[in-house]
């Protein structure tokens, strides 16, 4: 640093900045001796409004410094990211967002929870926003799952009427023929592959509605499909086997107590779908009157031993291998209770005793042509042999 | 030599989304300095739009905060400016460039019209 | 926002002379201001930073001065070359704000 020029008149004697310190320190700077600047941990050098990574000024032949002296500022975060379906709260002071201020995030309580963290963060001395996890992006808030105002826990015949509430991840699917499906988090619907197979090279086709209980009401929420995703295993009349397909929507929907998704089923799931145990079915498919109901109806019924189910279907005019390990199967020996024709698509749900969320653990799919015959079933795609597919899908797009 | 060199579509429709690019040759984004994008109106009124740091940390113009992002991709020392919700008030020659303007690129005309 | 007012929008000058480009801060921005010069067709060229400091290869018959709220840009022994537009810029705070320039023309 030291370049003893006789010529040349010492520079200015640098004073740095507050919040900052000088190097190196000596008693004068002549020609081509230099200092930089570096400030303390949470300030940055700024000159002006225009941060920078590092400064040095070199002392020039006239005497002056080549830079001028920048500053060292509290490092600013800015405001916060804005959370959808969510606040976020300045815990530190009103609009603070400076190095070591803290805010907390949080999620529309009942029908959103908050992913990822606790939704702390810090503003860290890189500038950034920082969860205690280290995570620079703002959390998410996810829709409740499997909420429902039923207390007790699709071709609907011999069901009875839905209330507000009751299956508010019920979605209607209009466009072809009348089907349905089930809502998952805010912007997917999980459907039959057999009941969207003919739109699904024309998604925007699909008119699909939300929120709805009588099924010609103009009091609905509306969404538009962006995306279908059909089943690579599924085979247009060859059988139900795959019967499962995906819509993906062009926008989120927001969350109520009339719109709100059903959960997929965790791992444990099977405990509460043995043989016996009691699976709902809603639709707006035909009633024992032989029509479309106008009105959501539902349907409580048990499943179906595998096997008993299978050799129900291998009787003519069936023929065997209908009834795959993809599928299960509900509905009364007697008869008189089952899902039919419009309730294709729907979710066969099911109570999870120890969350108290309902899950879908089948999804509409084929049955007897006469619904609720006796010693038939409906059949229904075994969907926890796709959470997989489902969870890659949506993953991904 | 520092160089800037910006590029993108020449031509958008009203209400579509415009993302710029601007190529960086001879100095690294990360190493120093903010990275600007400023634009210049028929009339020669110049604007500034906002700057991404060497860390990665921006500041927007007010006046565009809704609409505005600036994002940078350091593997190939690219800054990026997307702007949404575009309107015919929106063409203008837009420039990138380092710090107070020491470094300006050649600058790349925008036209909003349907 | 700190408007920059440069009140003259045109300056006539003859090559030789001295012309001094002003420019006025509606706040004190300290020194963060900049000027700049522009070519038809091309894009601007810093001259001057932090009020004062002239940017690398910057002939020096282009010198700035000023802090706070008034600043000038002076050019002594104008040149053919030096007719063109300049703008001031203040980048002392959000947003960075020019002037509206001042076109540079021979008498």
């Known amino acids: 640093h030291h370049h003893h020029h006789h010529a040349s008149q010492p520079c200015p004697y640098p004073m740095a900045p507050p919040n900052g310190h000088l190097s190196p320190v000596q008693a004068k700077y002549i020609l081509k001796d230099s200092f930089s600047i570096f400030c303390e941990p949470g300030y940055e050098l700024l000159q002006g409004h225009l941060p920078l990574k590092s400064f040095a000024a070199v002392c020039q032949k006239d005497g002056s410094w080549d830079q001028p002296m920048p500053s060292c500022s509290i490092v600013d975060c800015g405001p916060p990211d804005d959370l959808p379906s969510g606040r976020v709260e300045y815990i530190t002071g009103p609009e603070v967002t400076t190095y070591k201020a803290v805010i907390q995030y949080s999620c529309e309580e009942t029908f959103y929870t908050m992913k990822v963290n606790d939704g702390k963060y810090v503003c860290e001395a890189d500038g950034f926003w920082t969860s205690s996890k280290g995570e620079r992006s703002p959390p998410v808030c996810e829709p409740v799952c499997g909420l429902s105002a039923r207390t007790t826990g699709g071709r609907i015949y011999g069901g009875q009427k839905a209330k507000p509430g009751d299956f508010p991840w019920q979605v209607l699917i209009l466009g072809g023929s009348t089907a349905a499906g089930a809502l998952l988090y805010d912007n997917w619907v999980l459907t039959a592959a057999h009941a969207i197979y003919e739109q699904k090279h024309d998604a925007s086709s699909l008119d699909i509605r939300l929120g709805a209980l009588k099924r010609l009401s103009p009091h609905y929420t509306q969404a538009w499909a962006e995306a279908v995703f059909i089943h690579e295993g599924y085979t247009h009349d060859a059988g139900f086997d795959n019967d499962i397909a995906l819509i993906k929507l062009n926008n989120k929907v927001v969350i109520n107590s009339n719109i709100t998704p059903i959960c997929l089923p965790r791992k444990e799931a099977e405990s509460f779908m043995r043989t016996d145990d009691i699976g709902t079915a809603s639709g707006w498919g035909l009633t024992q009157r032989g029509l479309l109901a106008r009105n959501l109806m539902y349907v409580d019924i048990p499943i179906v031993d595998h096997q008993k189910c299978t050799a129900a279907y291998e009787k003519p005019p069936y023929s065997g291998g209908s009834v795959t390990a993809n599928m299960l199967c509900a509905g009364l020996e007697s008869g008189g209770k089952d899902s039919c024709r419009g309730d294709a698509g729907g979710a066969l749900v099911f109570l999870d005793n120890e969350t108290q969320r309902w899950f879908v653990g089948g999804i509409v799919s084929w049955g007897s042509m006469n619904c609720g015959e006796a010693g038939q079933y409906g059949v229904y795609t075994k969907v926890i042999n796709y959470i997989p597919w489902i969870k890659n899908i949506i993953s991904n797009f | 030599d520092v160089q800037l060199q910006e590029s993108g579509p020449g031509l958008v429709k009203p209400s579509q989304s415009l993302s710029l690019t601007c190529t960086v040759t001879?100095?690294?984004?990360?190493?120093?300095?903010?990275w600007n994008w400023i634009r210049q109106f028929s009339g020669d009124k110049l604007e500034w739009m906002g700057y991404?740091?060497?860390?990665?940390?921006?500041s927007y113009n007010p006046s565009l905060k809704s609409r505005i992002s600036i994002t940078r991709d350091t593997s190939k020392n690219q800054f990026f400016l997307h702007l949404s919700s575009v309107t015919t008030e929106d063409t203008a020659t837009y420039f990138c460039?380092?710090?107070?303007?020491?470094?300006w690129g050649h600058g790349t005309t925008l036209t909003v019209s349907s | 926002d700190s408007v920059m007012t440069q009140s003259q929008k045109f300056m006539s000058t003859s090559v030789g002379d001295r012309v001094s480009v002003t420019c006025k801060a509606s706040?004190?921005?300290?020194?963060?201001v900049a000027w700049f010069q522009q070519k038809p067709g091309q894009s601007p060229k810093g001259l001057i930073y932090s009020a004062s400091y002239r940017s690398s290869g910057v002939p020096d018959r282009f010198t700035g001065s000023g802090s706070g709220t008034d600043f000038t840009l002076t050019i002594s022994n104008v040149q053919s070359e030096d007719l063109a537009e300049y703008f001031c810029l203040q980048y002392n705070s959000n947003p960075l704000t020019f002037g509206g320039g001042t076109k540079l023309e021979v008498k």
């Open positions: 991404i740091s060497y860390s990665g940390s921006t």
């Open positions: 460039a380092r710090y107070w303007g020491d470094y």
């Open positions: 706040h004190n921005v300290g020194t963060n």
């Open positions: 001879g100095y690294s984004i990360t190493s120093d300095y903010a």
